[in-house]
Structures are given as C-alpha cells and as structure tokens.
C-alpha cells in the first residue's frame, strides 16, 4: 500500500518516493496510545511535509502528527481501534500519498525489561526471567517473546527460543562450560493484535561453570 505521488509543486515534476511505515503502541503512557510514522527513504526532504490520520477516531474526524526530527508522532486516547484509519502525507492541504491501516495490525510492543539470569546450584541450570509492561495492559496482553543468547565470542551465532511466558530454563549441559554468554529478549503481539517485534531489551551477561564445578561457589581468582 506504499504509494508514489507526483509532486505538482515541483517544476521538473520529479517523482518523489513518499512511501512510509508506521507502528502503534497501545496504552504506552497510561491509557494513552501512540502512533509513530517515518519515511522509508531517509533522504526525503521533510521540511514542508506533514502527516494526518483520519477515520476510526473517537470524537474527532482527523488528527495531525507532531514532527520529532525524522519521525512523526501522535499520543492520544482517541484511537477507536476498530476498523481502518487513513494516514496521509500532506503538503498544505494536498495529499501526496495515503495508506489505509488498521492500527491493531501494526502494534509494536514495548521492549521487555529486568532481564536476569540466575544459576541454580544443584539443579545445574540457568533460570532466565524478565518483565514486560504488557502484563498490566488491557489490550496487548498476549505476547510471543524471542529470547536470544550467544557465547560472547560467537559474534553472530545467536540461539533463539520462542516462548509465551516470562521465564525460561537453560540446561547447563546444553551450554559450553567455562564460557561467557550474552542474552537478550524482544516481544511481538501474539493474539488478535498483529505487528512488529519490539526493540531488544538491554543484554544480560552470565558465565557457565567449568564442567567439574557443578556446585559450590568458586571464585576463579
């Protein structure tokens, strides 16, 4: 649905690419929702360009976005969250390109936080826990989480585990002994709502014991 439009204001009638993408975040600030849009071409001259959303709104017909450097942003309680809204790029009163979007299909969850790993002596495993603000939300409550971990020396060799809970157990025998690991997690809507992966949580770092040290705290110094 990304559109191209001829900019009649330019004498040479050059064809500019005004295609854009948006994501919504529901109940991102109390009961307020947000909608963020940006041009896919970073070289678009955005000086006189505005974004407007119309339809599927409560009490108002249209809303204008605020411009924040390269992005366009709305924070409001007025999204109906039923049906499609029309989002347009405008110069003055002229629409250059529009997209009809259901805001419930472009949801980007907030990043998980409080990621932590604890080594369980005796059980010889690592319990991964994290938190998500979505547990307290009314709308986007059900998420799929992607936990990614790697041995720190393996730059791009991430192992991914998908789960719906906020707890994961990693068996020590499945990990390399005496190794340093990095772990992080992100989330995506998983029930009714659709959309995009959240940002990654901050990473947490943990070490695996040497093979012969299955219990007892060993200071390696």
């Amino acid at each position: 649905e990304s559109g191209y439009a001829q900019n009649g204001d330019l004498e040479d009638a050059e064809l500019d690419d005004y295609s854009f993408s948006c994501y919504s975040q529901l109940e991102v600030n109390g009961s307020q929702h947000s909608l963020t849009c940006a041009f896919e071409d970073p070289d678009v001259n955005i000086t006189n360009l505005e974004f407007e959303i119309c339809g599927a709104l409560v009490e108002v017909k249209c809303l204008n976005f605020r411009k924040l450097q390269e992005i366009y942003f709305i924070e409001t309680k007025k999204f109906l969250l039923i049906g499609k809204s029309n989002i347009c790029v405008k110069v003055g009163e002229k629409s250059l390109t529009c997209k009809k979007i259901d805001l419930t299909t472009i949801v980007k969850p907030e990043a998980p936080f409080d990621l932590s790993v604890v080594y369980r002596e005796g059980a010889n495993d690592f319990v991964v826990t994290f938190n998500t603000s979505h547990l307290q939300k009314k709308y986007v409550k059900v998420l799929m989480h992607d936990v990614a971990y790697r041995q720190e020396k393996d730059e791009n060799k991430w192992t991914h585990v998908n789960l719906s809970s906020t707890k994961l157990t990693l068996l020590q025998r499945k990990l390399q002994p005496a190794a340093m690991y990095e772990i992080k997690v992100r989330s995506i809507p998983d029930h009714y709502f659709k959309g995009f992966w959240s940002e990654w949580s901050p990473s947490y770092y943990f070490r695996t014991p040497e093979i012969n040290n299955s219990s007892g705290e060993m200071d390696p110094i």
Epitope: D114, R120, E121, V127
Partner: antibody
Framework: EVQLQQSGPELVKPGASVKMSCKAS????????MHWVKQSHGKSLEWIGY????????GYNQKFKGKATLTVDKSSSTVYMELRSLTSEDSALYYC?????????????WGQGTTLTVSS | DIVMTQSHKFMSTLVGDRVSITCKAS??????VAWYQQKPGQSPKLLIY???YRYTGVPDRFTGSGSGTDFTFTISSVQAEDLAVYYC?????????FGGGTKLEIK
C-alpha cells in the same frame, strides 16, 4: 584480597545532586557485576541497581529510575552512583556490593558504605 | 516485585541454643535465596546462597533450607558473636529484594 573502598560521608542540601564512588581491588574488575544497595536508618536493605563494568550495561530497580545513575571508569576500577533531586528520603547508608561470578545475582563482597545526609 | 517477608523482627536466644529464622517469598523463587548477616556498625556478609549452599569460610553451624516460597536459616548452636541482624534476599529475578531483617538477641 577483594576490597571495595567507598567514598566518604556526604552532607548535601535538598534538590542538589551527589556522586559517590566505589573503588574495587583484588580481582578482575570487569568480570563482575557491581550493585548498589540502600539502607535507610534502622531499616532493611533496598536494591538500587547494577552495572556491568566490562561494557557499562546496567539495570535499575524501577523505584530508583530517574533518581540513581550508575557509571563506571574501567581505568581506575571504580564505579560511581549519582543521586539527583535529593530529598530527606534519600538520607541513608549506601553500599556497593560485588555480584557473584556466574550470574551476579547475589552479593559476596560489600563496601563499607557511604553515609548520605540530606539537610538544609 | 517479589516481596520477601521475615515474620519475626526480633528473636531472643541463649548461647548454645538452636535458632531458626524464616523467610517467605510472595511467589515461587525456586531455590534462589541468599542469607546475609549484618553485625552492628558493619556491612552485610554473605552466609548462604541458593537456599542451602554455605559460602566460603562460613562456619558449619549456619545452614539454610527451603524451596519455592518458604525458606529457613538455622544456627545450630548460637555463639555470642552471632548477635546480628539476618536478612534473606531472593536472587531469582530483578529487582533483587530483601526481607525486613530479623535481629538476633542473646539473652
């Protein structure tokens, strides 16, 4: 011998900021998480947050987000905690504590504490 | 946040007696509980981690037990130098949380 040496007592006015330090010695500094814990007078212990010296990664108790900022100087094996917009509620004894080797989740060595008094 | 509750603020005991301090977690924390001793005017010291593992150099009169939500710290034969406040801490998830402390008094 592992040692965590904290900076001296601070007396500051309400609304001001303060930055206290914790200098580590006797172990490989960048290998261990460093945590900060608050102990109000005659009260229990409250975890503030951690910093991982190797890359400066940190995590905070949501209660202290915006109040505390943890930083690290690897060259001097020192971690810092800055507390801002101080009120009398921030008057307390603040400890740095080293997280354990594998996961950093509990605390095997503690500094001697820095006493913060907020008073006009 | 996980709340750690130490039901007794104070416990009084005689030298040589056995004493047990309890700690209850508001949710399952498996075996991820540590116990600390804080003597008057001193910093806390780690005694027990992972519910039942004695930290290096800690006398064997100190033991820990429990899993899930209920944990116990025991001194098998109390010595005069054990006068202190004892804290439990869950190391299961962030934020790390401590119990309110139990002050052990020697009669």
């Amino acid at each position: 011998e592992v040692q965590l040496q904290q900076s001296g007592p601070e007396l500051v006015k309400p609304g001001a900021s303060v930055k206290m330090s914790c200098k580590a010695s006797g172990y490989t500094f960048s290998d261990y998480y460093m945590h900060w814990v608050k102990q109000s007078h005659g009260k229990s212990l409250e975890w503030i947050g951690y910093i991982y010296p190797d890359n400066g990664g940190n995590g905070y108790n949501q209660k202290f987000k915006g109040k505390a900022t943890l930083t690290v100087d690897k060259s001097s094996s020192t971690v810092y905690m800055e507390l801002r917009s101080l009120t009398s509620e921030d008057s307390a004894l603040y400890y740095c504590a080293r997280g354990t080797y594998y996961d950093g989740s509990y605390f095997d060595y503690w500094g001697q504490g820095t006493t913060l008094t907020v008073s006009s | 946040d996980i709340v750690m509750t130490q039901s007794h603020k104070f416990m009084s005991t005689l030298v040589g007696d056995r004493v047990s301090i309890t700690c209850k977690a508001s949710q399952d924390v498996s075996t991820t509980v540590a116990w600390y001793q804080q003597k008057p005017g001193q910093s806390p010291k780690l005694l027990i981690y992972s519910a039942s593992y004695r930290y290096t150099g800690v006398p064997d009169r100190f033991t820990g037990s429990g899993s899930g939500t209920d944990f116990t710290f025991t001194i098998s034969s109390v010595q005069a130098e054990d006068l202190a406040v004892y804290y439990c801490q869950q190391h299961y998830s962030i934020p790390r949380t401590f119990g309110g402390g139990t002050k052990l008094e020697i009669k």
